[in-house]
């Protein structure tokens, strides 16, 4: 007995062959001995089965002695044997479909889980292997999970079903709602423009939700709110935000904040947080303020760095083209009685300089310059 | 901790006037949002009133609207409403409530004032 | 003004038990949403902001769902101090409006 596998919703064709090229009556039956369909000579004539409306056959393979049944939109419920009776011969066709769904929807968001269940006929006991997007196999029975999805998952996932032998190949896309980076930090000089930029991974034709910018200060006791706002169709729109620092937001994605000014009060680390419409659960991203303060006050020169910096920072101070006067991995660095000259007050990352402030030192009898 | 303290409710005829006051400590009060929230004996909850940080911004109920007057004294740490043309309707216990929590959220509530207006 | 209605307005539950508390604005409130407790003579308290998300040091039999204007709100396994009033509130436009409250009493 020949097996033919189908996926669900698909057309699936069951040949039939006779000996003689030539058009002959042909019958096409299912294990109940149904009828599904024939010929009368040339005329295509339908039996009283459940599959009237979706079979049907080729009249023009008829006279080379093909005569297939096409059933389209296939069930779960139309795995049978499927009987041609030509010339005589019976020819008998065993027909298995499956159908894999994702779990809800294939809108998910990062950190979710992923489930695909498996559809498959009475007394079939098929095994799937799925491949994701980044190269991840998986395997299962009836239903396949992954969890915690990660942005690398967003894609087209290829699932193949193994029964008797035979293989069905499944593609599933698959939008996994993230932000591009889960976290990001901005190093800026104090009194600089601040800007935050929250790019989505993903694109949807509507995008309706709400969020806010929720933030720590390095300085401050407790946390507290920035700024809330609403997004409809991919237009934001503010909400409400706090009198200091007075954020403001750009009406169109991707989301982007700015700050008037960095401060060393201002800086710390905030979380993003985006509710989507009709999704249970949140998208989240971290942002970092870093900043940076030089002064001279009488005859100290100091640099001052304030918010999230990592241990293996370096802070230097060090006159113009000249070897570094003091370089420490702490967060404030000063050079007593300095020379007069432009100094650099740097902060840096295995040699490579993150954030930079210049100030120039007069002779002693006059007062400082900030460029 | 965060700790608001109402006071100033009491007994009042109808037609007259109250002022309570919230004595907020143990955070910033001059970064944050605050309401008053009431809630009348054996009922739900009724939000009646909130004010920006700086007080430029006040919103109101209907039901209070031109009666009731929502303010604030930063440098005094304290919340205020001025309740005049009082109800019978209006009794109810007053809650001085921070709007610090995440997403407008309330999240921190007084001990509540109880105002009865009553002949 | 937005009208929130909460169902059932008071539920009968055993210690242990899982108890549902539905909460239906009059029109689209996308998150804006908070659940609180109540106790008899206490303030209310925030259990859950942002429709789904828990208040710090709320426990986690506590979850709340939903967006748009149906929302949920999940106690998982009852405890005796869970026995309460419970209300919803809509922060998405003035004036902030509470549901009518959820009783959950000892059966």
């Known amino acids: 007995k020949k097996v033919v596998l189908g996926k669900k919703g698909d057309t699936v064709e069951l040949t039939c062959t006779a000996s003689q090229k030539k058009s002959i009556q042909f019958h096409w039956k299912n294990s109940n001995q149904i009828k599904i369909l024939g010929n009368q000579g040339s005329f295509l004539t339908k039996g009283p089965s459940k599959l009237n409306d979706r079979a049907d056959s080729r009249r023009s393979l008829w006279d080379q002695g093909n005569f297939p049944l096409i059933i389209k939109n296939l069930k779960i419920e139309d795995s049978d044997t499927y009987i041609c009776e030509v010339e005589d011969q019976k020819e008998e066709v065993q027909l298995l479909v499956f159908g894999l769904t994702a779990n809800s929807d294939t809108h998910l968001l990062q950190g979710q889980s992923l489930t695909l269940t498996l559809e498959s006929p009475p007394g079939s006991s098929p095994s799937v292997q799925c491949r994701s997007p980044r190269g991840k196999n998986i395997q299962g029975g009836k239903t396949l999970s992954v969890s915690q999805l990660e942005l690398q998952d967003s894609g087209t996932w290829t699932c193949t079903v193994l029964q008797n032998q035979k293989k069905v190949e499944f593609k599933i896309d698959i939008v996994v709602l993230a932000f591009q980076k889960a976290s990001s930090i901005v190093y800026k000089k104090e009194g600089e423009q601040v800007e935050f930029s929250f790019p989505l991974a993903f694109t949807v034709e509507k995008l309706t939700g709400s969020g806010e910018l929720w933030w720590q200060a390095e300085r401050a006791s407790s946390s507290k709110s920035w700024i809330t706002f609403d997004l409809k169709n991919k237009e934001v729109s503010v909400k409400r935000v706090t009198q200091d620092p007075k954020l403001q937001m750009g009406k169109k994605l991707p989301l982007h904040l700015t700050l008037p000014q960095a401060l060393p009060q201002y800086a710390g680390s905030g979380n993003l947080t985006l509710a989507l419409e009709a999704k249970t659960g949140k998208l989240h991203q971290e942002v970092n303020l870093v900043v940076m303060r030089a002064t001279q006050l009488q005859k100290n020169l100091t640099c001052e760095v304030w918010g999230p910096t990592s241990p293996k920072l370096m802070l230097s101070l060090k006159l113009e083209n000249k070897e570094a006067k003091v370089s420490k991995r702490e967060k404030a660095v000063w050079v007593l009685n300095p020379e007069a000259g432009m100094w650099q007050c740097l902060l840096s990352d295995s040699g490579q300089v993150l954030l930079e402030s210049n100030i120039k030192v007069l002779p002693t009898w006059s007062t400082p310059v900030q460029p | 901790e965060v700790q608001l303290v109402e006071s100033g409710g009491g007994l009042v005829q109808p037609g007259g006037s109250l002022r309570l006051s919230c004595a907020a400590s143990?955070?910033?009060?001059?970064?944050?949002?605050m309401s008053w929230v009431r809630q009348a004996p054996g009922k739900g909850l009724e939000w009646v009133a909130n004010?920006?940080?700086?007080?430029?911004?006040?919103y109101y109920v209907d039901s209070v609207k031109g009666r009731f007057t929502i303010s604030r004294d930063n440098a005094k740490n304290s919340l205020y409403l001025q309740m005049n043309s009082l109800r019978a309707e209006d009794t109810a216990v007053y809650y001085c409530v921070r709007e610090g929590g995440q997403w407008l959220a309330l999240d921190y509530w007084g001990q509540g004032t109880l105002v009865t207006v009553s002949s | 003004d937005i009208q929130m209605t909460q169902s059932p307005s008071s539920v009968s539950a055993s210690v242990g038990d899982r108890v549902t508390i539905t909460c239906r604005a009059s029109?689209?409130?996308?998150?804006?949403l908070a659940w609180y407790q109540q106790k008899p003579g206490k303030a209310p308290k925030l259990l859950i902001y942002a429709a789904s998300s828990l208040q710090s040091g709320v426990p986690s039999s506590f979850s709340g769902s939903g967006s748009g204007t149906d929302f949920t709100l999940t106690i998982n396994s009852l405890q005796p101090e869970d026995f309460a009033t419970y209300y919803c509130?809509?922060?998405?436009?003035?004036?902030?409006?509470f549901g009518q409250g959820t009783k959950v009493a000892i059966k």
């Open positions: 509130q809509q922060a998405n436009s003035f004036p902030w409006t």
């Open positions: 143990g955070f910033t009060f001059s970064s944050y949002w």
């Open positions: 004010i920006n940080e700086d007080g430029s911004e006040k």
């Open positions: 029109q689209g409130i996308s998150s804006w």
